[in-house]
């Protein structure tokens, strides 16, 4: 597990100092108060796929 | 192995209130949402609301703003309170745990996987 | 809300042959940035607490045996028993936890023909 102060998450996922995990960020669509939130509202969400430009 | 164990009154009045407590054993308290869902006799499930460590809700606006769910970190529990009564609100009520499952290495919830025992609660004058 | 309908609401089926259980959704549960569908399976027994069979439309809880499966996307989605046993007759349930109120389908009721 990744332990805080080391490489971050991978994008689009936050760091839960709760969980002790690296946690999606489509989580806090509904659940916008998890720890790991705040960490989500400052990058954007991992592309799925290629958008046309 | 995380274990859920609930209690609370049995048997009500209508517009008495309804009180219920969930203890969590053997697990992580914290990071994990914990849910209540009922369901009335014969028919199917209805999400109450959740709650995480820190307070912070999320709840069925069928209920009209009747529920109040509280959290206890100290002892592990969580609790359910709806006002007002009626024999509409007569079921069994169930807590549950939002499990948490990974793929590569990115953790998302995933699902209420374990489960209390279920309160029957009648409301009948 | 997200209204959640399954079908049929019984489903009489023999011993070792295919179940299957549909649940369709008002709108798409489906979250474009993960491609993640935020619905769950459950098998709830008489007496019993619903018990987490699939996660994420397709994910297999921990312990569940792999005669259950769920696919589809979006707004379509089905729950298969690939060879019924006695222990499977019981009421199956979708809900989503795309947004909140998380919603139940009204259950499908599954026996033994």
């Known amino acids: 597990e990744q332990a805080p102060g080391t490489a971050p998450c991978s994008r689009g996922s936050s760091w839960s100092a709760d969980l002790d995990k690296c946690m999606d960020c489509a989580s806090c669509r509904a659940r916008p108060h998890s720890d790991f939130c705040l960490g989500c509202a400052a990058a954007p969400p991992a592309p799925f796929r290629l958008l046309w430009p | 192995q995380v274990q859920l164990q609930q209690w609370g009154a049995g048997l009500l009045k209508p517009s008495e209130t309804l009180s219920l407590t969930c203890a969590v054993y053997g697990g992580s308290f914290s990071g994990y949402y914990w849910s209540w869902i009922r369901q009335p006799p014969g028919k199917g499930l209805e999400w109450i609301g959740e709650i995480n460590h820190r307070g912070s809700t999320n709840s069925n606006p069928s209920l009209k703003s009747r529920d109040t769910i509280s959290v206890d970190t100290s002892k592990n529990q969580f609790s359910l309170r709806l006002r007002s009564v009626t024999a509409a609100d007569t079921a069994v009520y169930y807590c549950?745990?939002?499990?948490?499952?990974?793929?590569?290495?990115?953790?998302?919830?995933?699902?209420?996987?374990?489960w209390g025992q279920g309160t029957t609660v009648t409301v009948s004058s | 809300d997200i209204v959640m309908t399954q079908s049929p609401d019984s489903l009489a089926v023999s011993l070792g042959e295919r179940a299957t259980i549909n649940c369709k959704s008002r709108?798409?549960?489906?979250?474009?940035?993960?491609?993640?569908?935020?619905l769950t399976w459950y098998q709830q027994k008489p007496g019993q607490p619903p018990k987490l069979l699939i996660y994420w439309a397709s994910t297999r809880e921990s312990g569940v045996p792999d005669r259950f499966s769920g696919s589809g996307s979006g707004t379509d989605f089905t729950l298969t028993i690939s060879s019924l046993q006695a222990e499977d007759v019981a009421v199956y349930y979708c809900q989503q936890y795309y947004s909140t109120p998380y919603t139940f389908g009204q259950g499908t009721k599954l026996e033994i023909k």
């Open positions: 549950a745990r939002e499990g948490i499952s990974g793929s590569m290495g990115i953790y998302d919830y995933s699902g209420m996987d374990v």
């Open positions: 709108q798409s549960i489906l979250y474009s940035s993960n491609n993640k569908n935020y």
